[in-house]
C-alpha cells in the first residue's frame, strides 16, 4: 500500500495506424498536489507527451475533464496514430517540489503496439529482356508494416514459385518494418501472356492479401523461326519467294531481303497475326524477275528481332531451272541470336 | 492498524539539538510520507517538514535552517532534529502519515529549558 | 507563505443548530481543479483529527453532519446539527504551497 499509486490498467494496446489510442490511468489520491505527465519511454531521454500543468499537445486529449474537482482519471487519447508512436507510455505524478515539481509516482507503464499496413507490394524484374530457358529474378518490396510478422509468396500463373529469397529489415526492434523478396523464373516460349504476382500476408490486412503483379511480356523476349519457300507465278518469268517469320515477341522486327548478297528491300514487320500464346507471326514475300538474271540467285532473309544480331536463311533460286521448280532451302545463319 | 508513536526527551536546554523518533506500524516508509507537525502551549498548530517515501525532504522555510529530517525505513522510524533551540521551540511535537495527514501519533512534549 | 485566517476565533452554538466556520487563505489554494484545503478537528490533549480533505469531502469515519465547501481562498466548514461531542478547536490547513500552514483555530463551545 502507498499512500498514491498511479495505476495503469492496460499493460499493452494495440491500435491501427490512423487511429485513436487510448491511454489509461487513474490515481489512488489527489494529495500532494502536482501535475500528471505522460512520457514515452524511461529514463533521462524519455520524450513528453502529455503534461497537466503546462504546454501545447494538440494531438492529446484527456479522456475526463482534469479541471473537475476529485477527478483522478488522468487517462489520454493520442490521435491519428502512426508506427512512429510505438512505445512504452508512462502516466507521472508529479509533487510541487521547490523550486521545481518533483516526480513522486509512475505507473508500470503501457506499451503501445502499433498495427500499419505493408504498403502496396511493387514487382520489378530484369532490366533486360531474356530469352526461354533463361532463368530471370523479379523482386519484390514493400513498406512500412507493423508488427514484423510477414508472410509473402511468389506465383506464377496461379502457381506458387519455391525459388525465392525474403529478408525483413531491420532485423531488431522498429517502429516499422520492410520486405524484399527476390525470385527466380524460368522463362518458357509460352510466357508472353504469363503474370509473375507477389503476394503479401500481414495481420493487418484480415486475410485479405496485397498482391503486386508483373507480366512476363516485359520480360521476355521470344526469337522468330524463319522459313523461306518458293511459289510459282503465272508469269512464268517470275518466281514469289516468302519468308515466314514465326513465333516472335515483341513486335519489334525489321526484315531484309538480299539477293546475292545484294539489299534488294526492307521492311518493317506492321501487319503480323497474333498467336494464341501472345507471340507473332508475319510473313514477307519476294518477287523475282528471272530472266533478269544469267546465273543462279542466292536469296536471303534477314531478320532483325528487338534490336538483336540478325538471324537469316537463304533459298537458291535456279535460273536454268523451270520457274515452277523449286530450288534447294540452305540451313538457316542464326548469327547471334539468344535461343534458349 | 495504522499507528503512529512520538519519542525522546521531554526536556531540551536551550542551543541544543532536539531529537525526536517517530516509530510506525501498520504501513511502509517507502510507501509514506511521515509529517512532523507541532503545537506550542495554548497556540496553533506549525507544519515543520515531511519525507517523502523516497527520502526526498521539504521543509518549513522558517525551520529550514535548523531542521533535518531523516528515517530508517528498516526500522519503521522517521527522526526528527531541531539544533539550536530556544523556549519558543518548546510544544508538543506530533508525526502524522502522508500528504493527506490522515493518521497523526498522540504527540510529545519538549520542554526547552536550562 | 499562503496565510490562513480563521473566523470567528470563537464560537459557541446550541446542540441542534448549525456552525459555520470561515478560513480565508491569503492566496489561492487551487491546483489542478481542486482545493487543496483541509480540515481537521481537535479535543483537548488529543492530536487533530481529519475531518474534511480537498475542501469538500468527508473523511471515513467521520458523521455528514460536517460538510465543506469553497474554492480559490474562501472556504467553509459546516457542523449541522451540532452536538455535545463537538466542542473542540478546529483547524483549516493547506497544502497546495510550500510551507504547509495551518489556520490559527477556531474554538466552538456549545450552550
Known amino acids: 500500500e502507498e499512500e498514491l499509486q498511479v495505476i495503469q490498467p492496460d499493460k499493452s494496446v494495440l491500435v491501427a495506424a490512423g487511429e485513436t489510442a487510448t491511454l489509461r490511468c487513474t490515481a489512488t489520491s489527489l494529495i500532494p498536489v502536482g501535475p500528471i505527465q505522460w512520457f514515452r519511454g524511461a529514463g533521462p531521454g524519455r520524450e513528453l507527451i502529455y503534461n497537466q500543468k503546462e504546454g501545447h499537445f494538440p494531438r492529446v486529449t484527456t479522456v475526463s475533464d482534469l479541471t473537475k474537482r476529485n477527478n483522478m482519471d488522468f487517462s489520454i487519447r493520442i490521435g491519428n496514430i502512426t508506427p512512429a508512436d510505438a512505445g512504452t507510455y508512462y502516466c507521472v505524478k508529479f509533487r510541487k517540489g521547490s523550486p521545481d515539481d518533483v516526480e513522486f509516482k509512475s505507473g508500470a507503464g503501457t506499451e503501445l503496439s502499433v498495427r500499419a499496413k505493408p504498403s502496396a507490394p511493387v514487382v520489378s524484374g530484369p532490366a533486360a529482356r531474356a530469352t526461354p530457358q533463361h532463368t530471370v529474378s523479379f523482386t519484390c518490396e514493400s513498406h512500412g508494416f507493423s508488427p514484423r510478422d510477414i508472410t509473402l509468396k511468389w506465383f506464377k500463373n496461379g502457381n506458387e514459385l519455391s525459388d525465392f529469397q525474403t529478408n525483413v529489415d531491420p532485423v531488431g526492434e522498429s517502429v516499422s518494418y520492410s520486405i524484399h523478396s527476390t525470385a527466380k523464373v524460368v522463362l518458357t516460349r509460352e510466357d508472353v501472356h504469363s503474370q509473375v504476382i507477389c503476394e503479401v500476408a500481414h495481420v493487418t490486412l484480415q486475410g485479405d492479401p496485397l498482391r503486386g503483379t508483373a507480366n512476363l511480356s516485359e520480360t521476355i523476349r521470344v526469337p522468330p523461326t524463319l522459313e523461306v519457300t518458293q511459289q510459282p507465278v503465272r508469269a512464268e518469268n517470275q518466281v514469289n519467294v516468302t519468308c515466314q517469320v514465326r513465333k516472335f515477341y515483341p513486335q519489334r522486327l525489321q526484315l531484309t531481303w538480299l539477293e546475292n548478297g545484294n539489299v534488294s528491300r526492307t521492311e518493317t514487320a506492321s501487319t503480323v497475326t497474333e498467336n494464341k500464346d501472345g507471340t507473332y507471326n508475319w510473313m514477307s514475300w519476294l518477287l523475282v524477275n528471272v530472266s533478269a538474271h544469267r546465273d543462279d540467285v542466292k536469296l536471303t532473309c534477314q531478320v532483325e528481332h528487338d534490336g538483336q544480331p540478325a538471324v537469316s536463311k537463304s533459298h537458291d533460286l535456279k535460273v536454268s531451272a523451270h520457274p515452277k521448280e523449286q530450288g534447294s532451302n540452305t540451313a538457316a545463319e542464326n548469327t547471334g541470336s539468344n535461343e534458349r | 492498524q495504522v499507528q503512529l508513536q512520538e519519542s525522546g526527551p521531554g526536556l531540551v536546554k536551550p542551543s541544543q539539538t532536539l531529537s525526536l523518533t517517530c516509530t510506525v506500524s501498520?504501513?511502509?516508509?517507502?510507501?509514506?510520507?511521515v509529517n512532523w507537525i507541532r503545537q506550542p502551549p495554548g497556540k496553533g498548530l506549525e507544519w515543520i517538514g515531511i519525507?517523502?517515501?523516497?527520502?526526498?525532504?521539504d521543509y518549513n522555510s522558517a525551520l529550514k535552517s535548523r531542521v533535518t529530517i531523516s528515517k530508517d525505513t528498516s526500522k519503521n522510524q522517521v527522526f526528527l532534529k531541531l539544533s539550536s533551540v530556544t523556549a519558543a521551540d518548546t510544544a508538543v511535537y506530533y508525526c502524522?502519515?502522508?500528504?493527506?495527514?490522515?493518521?497523526w501519533g498522540q504527540g510529545t512534549t519538549v520542554t526547552v529549558s536550562s | 507563505d499562503i496565510v490562513l485566517t480563521q473566523s470567528p476565533a470563537s464560537l459557541a452554538v446550541s446542540p441542534g443548530q448549525r456552525a459555520t466556520i470561515t478560513c480565508r487563505a491569503s492566496?489561492?489554494?487551487?491546483?489542478?481543479?481542486?482545493?487543496?484545503m483541509h480540515w481537521y478537528q481537535q479535543k483537548p490533549g488529543q492530536p487533530p483529527k481529519p475531518l474534511i480533505y480537498?475542501?469538500?469531502n468527508l473523511e471515513s469515519g467521520v458523521p455528514a453532519r460536517f460538510s465543506g465547501s469553497g474554492s480559490g481562498t474562501d472556504f467553509t466548514l459546516t457542523i449541522n446539527p451540532v452536538e455535545a461531542n463537538d466542542a473542540a478547536n478546529y483547524y483549516c490547513?493547506?497544502?497546495?504551497?510550500?510551507?504547509?500552514?495551518f489556520g490559527g483555530g477556531t474554538k466552538v463551545e456549545i450552550k
Open positions: 502524522a502519515r502522508a500528504g493527506k495527514m490522515d493518521y
Open positions: 501498520g504501513f511502509s516508509l517507502t510507501g509514506y510520507g
Open positions: 519525507i517523502w517515501g523516497d527520502g526526498s525532504t
Open positions: 492566496e489561492s489554494v487551487d491546483s489542478y481543479g481542486n482545493s487543496f
Open positions: 480537498l475542501a469538500s
Open positions: 490547513q493547506q497544502n497546495n504551497e510550500y510551507p504547509w500552514t
